[in-house]
Interface confidence: low
């Protein structure tokens, strides 16, 4: 579904078309998609509205390690990268651009998962790696959210919503010593309730981009810079979920 | 600069039809929802239209409905008001407004908007 | 087209604080819809002062804030000033999508 051809995946991160990334992609500004509007206050001006997280915990509440959910995979069922010597420095720091193997690709079994859902990136994110979701969207959606996480830090959070005062956006954030940052907003929105989707996720030096269903959405500039710390992808809302994956190309 | 200019704004008489323009600068105009709003002279503010950056979501005011189109064009950073069937209560100045990507009801952006009067 | 309902007219003095209130209903303003409020000086465009309840654009004087309750609004403007004074304007999507204004206030400042 995916049609990456991975044989020849690239070493460098200047490529503006890498690799199994959407052939439509130009070479975007950084933090293009981004509100490019009024810097809104630090305080969190998304802060559930009623109804916002039904039945679950906020982004970033997820409890526990991977597998605290019921009924999701125990620990240990996500094939990991090859144990060899150097695969990842023992620091969680790449050495290098092919730290992480270019072979794969990682993460979470086939088949339908458990949402909330925890995908564990091992020795954090680099440039060149690129995690893909696929799922549907449950009828009637109200939202979707993807939180990069380094600790109890949102280092990337990812919120598509469906009925925000009647309007359908993606809130892009990050959630710093419990406070949320500046939003960037998206008005442009790809996601349809009942229908599948493939979100992917690229992770270049100083941004993630972010395609869906194979067009370029938007790019979110870093603002964690410790990337190799950001060890855990939740993926949470109103969507039945295929599988997360990783690999690097 | 963020900018909306707008134009088109003129005498008509009851019942004939005009449309406005709005030009954009300064933004990433298709991601934005642009609404008009209007003012009568003397009175207050009042919501007319919205339109969504795909064009996908449109909404108007009831007082207008049937009467009023709302349109962009991406391509051209431009957003009009298409307006038929006018009338007297009609006049007024027209605003081209930006919502804020946040879209909890701030509306960020602001022309000096265009003059249109109804009158035999 | 149901209007937010706002007082014609406040005034206070140099310093002083007042208040605005916007009443709605549980369709607009008391229906998790968020409220903005607008600033417009005599023969100028409106200018956003507060967004999503309480929340200023950069830019703007924390002198203003924003507060909501149940079904009614309010804005507080704190040590007031000259160049204060000029209409005001609360705002709220609807359940049916649509935007509403208020009336609109009058702040005089004495």
């Known amino acids: 579904a995916d049609n990456f051809s991975l044989h020849d995946a690239l070493s460098g991160s200047g490529n503006p078309n890498p690799q199994g990334w959407p052939g439509a992609w130009g070479n975007q500004p950084a933090g293009a998609g981004g509100y490019p509007g009024a810097s809104y206050p630090g305080a969190y001006p998304g802060q559930a509205p009623p109804g916002a997280y039904p039945g679950q915990a906020p982004p970033g509440a997820y409890p526990g390690a991977p597998g605290a959910y019921p009924g999701a995979p125990a620990p240990g069922v996500y094939p990991g990268p090859p144990s060899g010597p150097g695969a990842y420095p023992s620091s969680g720091q790449p050495s290098a651009t092919g730290a992480y193997p270019a072979t794969g690709p990682y993460g979470a079994p086939a088949g339908p998962l458990i949402v909330p859902y925890n995908l564990p990136l091992p020795g954090g994110v680099v440039p060149r790696m690129l995690i893909t979701i696929l799922g549907t969207v449950k009828p009637n959606a109200n939202r979707i959210a993807l939180d990069f996480q380094r600790g109890n830090d949102v280092a990337f959070h990812f919120n598509p919503r469906f009925n925000e005062n009647n309007r359908r956006v993606i809130v892009c954030n990050t959630k710093l010593d419990n406070n949320w940052g500046r939003e960037e907003r998206q008005s442009v929105f790809p996601f349809e309730s009942g229908k599948p989707f493939k979100i992917q996720v690229l992770v270049e030096p100083d941004h993630f981009k972010v395609a869906v269903n194979d067009a370029h959405l938007l790019q979110y500039n870093h603002r964690v810079k410790k990337l190799n710390e950001i060890s855990k992808l939740g993926i949470s809302g109103d969507i039945d979920l295929t599988s997360a994956s990783y690999t690097m190309i | 600069e963020v900018q909306l200019v707008e134009s088109g704004g003129s005498l008509v008489k009851p019942g004939g039809s005009l449309r406005l323009s709005c030009a954009a600068s300064?933004?990433?105009?298709?991601?934005?929802?642009m609404n008009w709003v209007r003012q009568a002279p003397g009175k207050g503010l009042e919501w007319i239209s919205s339109?969504?950056?795909?064009?996908?979501?449109?909404y108007y005011a009831d007082f207008v409905k049937g009467r009023f189109t709302i349109s962009r064009d991406n391509a051209k950073n431009s957003l009009y008001l298409q307006m038929n069937s006018l009338r007297a209560e009609d006049t007024a100045v027209y605003y081209c407004?930006?919502?804020?990507?946040?879209?909890?009801?701030?509306?960020?952006?602001w022309g000096r908007g265009t003059l249109v009067t109804v009158s035999s | 087209q149901s209007v937010l309902t706002q007082p014609a007219s406040v005034s206070g003095s140099p310093g002083q604080s007042i208040t605005i209130s916007c009443a709605g209903t549980?369709?607009?303003?008391?229906?998790?819809?968020?409220v903005a409020w607008y600033q417009q000086h005599p023969g100028k465009a409106p200018k956003l002062m507060i967004y999503?309840?309480?929340y200023r654009p950069s830019g703007v004087s924390n002198r203003f804030s924003g507060s909501k309750s149940g079904n009614t609004a309010s804005l507080t403007i704190s040590g007031l000033q000259a160049e204060d004074e000029a209409d005001y304007y609360c705002?709220?999507?609807?359940?049916?999508?649509?935007?509403?204004f208020g009336g609109g206030t009058k702040l005089e400042i004495k």
């Open positions: 407004v930006r919502s804020s990507g946040y879209s909890g009801g701030g509306m960020d952006v």
């Open positions: 999503s309840d309480s």
């Open positions: 549980s369709s607009d303003v008391g229906g998790s819809y968020n």
């Open positions: 705002s709220s999507y609807t359940s049916n999508s649509a935007r509403v």
């Open positions: 339109i969504d950056g795909s064009s996908r979501s449109i």
């Open positions: 300064g933004f990433t105009f298709s991601n934005d929802d």
